[in-house]
Interface confidence: low
């Protein structure tokens, strides 16, 4: 806590400018009016304050807004955001995507901090669902964001938002998450033609059931082995040799290299040897 001291004569801040970097902590506390700071928060980021000085500025804002900062201040916090605790952020009501972007920009290049996680949680809860623009923004800053959500949280993602998802956004998703995302992706891409549909749905196929894989096998999609290896084992097991051959197209030869790994290993064990032999790959059931 900064000790309350009178502001020296002639040092009362008329505006937030670079002269303040020469103020000691106690002078900032005594000479900078909190209301002035709040109205000129956009200037703070342009001034190379030390972290100690930023602590003083945060303290002044906390006193002015004990119930939580208004969005007009939050949007211009800049580096001061890094000083906020999750408890501070829980008091906020952030509704503007521009505010969210501004604060994520401050943390750019770093792992998702507890502060950022709390901010995102507040923002998404305020909106009621993960709309497309929000998802677009979050995955741009944190490609793994989608896979950090629980299946229950993912249930609030509307199918229209799935258009914002890039393949790399799903890299760390587990089967339970893809179980939720796949049907949404199917709905989102339902009006696309066969080849375009496959390009879009491919990243989500780790949540696809057997019947959809069978349907895809009828559409000359030529699934690559990397995608095939991410399919649910229980979805792959009922596929016939002919269906897998159609599904993979020219990539079927890659099964040999993966014969010891799931789901290929388990699938091979379910097939008749005569059927496997038709592939001419030397696969042994």
């Amino acid at each position: 806590e900064v000790e309350k001291t009178a502001c020296p004569s002639g040092k009362k801040a008329r505006e937030i400018d670079e002269s303040l970097i020469f103020y000691k902590k106690w002078e900032l506390e005594a000479c900078v009016d909190a209301a002035l700071l709040a109205t000129q928060m956009d200037r703070v980021n342009a001034i190379p304050f030390t972290y100690e000085q930023l602590d003083v500025l945060k303290h002044k804002l906390d006193e002015l807004y004990p119930q939580g900062y208004p969005e007009s201040v939050i949007q211009h916090l800049g580096y001061l955001f890094l000083k906020m605790s999750p408890e501070d952020i829980r008091k906020w009501n952030v509704t503007s995507l521009e505010t969210l972007k501004a604060l994520l920009e401050v943390n750019k290049g770093h792992e998702m901090s507890p502060q950022v996680a709390t901010l995102i949680d507040r923002f998404v809860k305020g909106r009621g669902q993960l709309d497309k623009d929000t998802l677009d923004t979050l995955t741009a800053f944190y490609p793994g964001y989608l896979c950090s959500l629980s299946p229950e949280e993912l249930s609030s993602v509307p199918p229209s938002s799935i258009w914002a998802v890039r393949p790399q956004d799903l890299d760390t998703c587990d089967p339970r998450q893809l179980d939720v995302l796949y049907p949404k992706a199917r709905l989102a891409f339902q009006n696309m033609n066969g080849s375009e549909y496959f390009v879009k749905i491919q990243s989500f196929l780790g949540g696809a059931p057997t019947e959809d894989l069978k349907a895809l096998s009828q559409q000359n999609v030529s699934m690559d082995l990397a995608t095939f290896m991410k399919l649910r084992t229980d979805a792959v097991l009922p596929l016939t040799v002919a269906e897998v051959q159609k599904l993979l197209g020219p990539h079927v030869e890659g099964l040999k290299a993966e014969e010891r790994h799931r789901p290929v290993r388990d699938w091979i064990l379910r097939q008749r040897q005569d059927d496997l032999d038709t592939l001419g790959l030397g696969l042994q059931g």
Epitope: P151, D179, P209
Partner: antibody, heavy 119, light 107 residues
Amino acid sequence: EVQLLESGGGLVQPGGSLRLSCAASGLTFRSYAMTWVRQAPGKGLEWVSGISVSGGITYYADVVKGRFTISRDNSKNTLYLQMNSLRAEDTAVYYCAKRGAAVGSFDYWGQGTLVTVSS
Amino acid sequence: DIQMTQSPSSLSASVGDRVTITCRSSQGIGSWLAWYQQKPEKAPQSLIYAASSLQSGVPSRFSGSGSGTDFTLTISNLQPEDFATYYCQQYNSYPLTFGGGTKVEIK
């Protein structure tokens, strides 16, 4: 062989409640999304509700939303349908069916259980 | 909601006939259509999924075709056990919806 066996149907008064169960065998229950479909006497098929593999996602027809609750217990290989505030128009044979996804066709069906709502 | 309209609602045919049932959706559903057979007092049975894929164990005299909004179920050589009611169902989007059914009766 996949088998789905419904139970819990019966006669109930309007406004009453019933809980239907569907015991599954011959399949890895936890790997499949499930659904309830009903058929009023002499009428066609009507989809009622669906549930995802984990049970985390549920879907309902508008006519039952807020009154019916679908759930599952993967440890017991059982699907449930809790039906509250029953109406005469809910009278039907209720079938549970196995699906491969949260949206999909139904490849195995139970034999059905009759629910009669009447005073 | 997507409406599914089946025609005819009933038809009479003889053993050995070729029977065609049509199903039309109120909006495009790609190939996400299934066909079911139901006999009196029995549960429905899956015949076709993905518009044209035959369910395991279903005789090859049953076939499905179509995509978008217009679909057809064909029974090429009607057998005594095929007299039943047939339903189409879309699984393109929620709520999942069925056609009104087509009853195939003995002439």
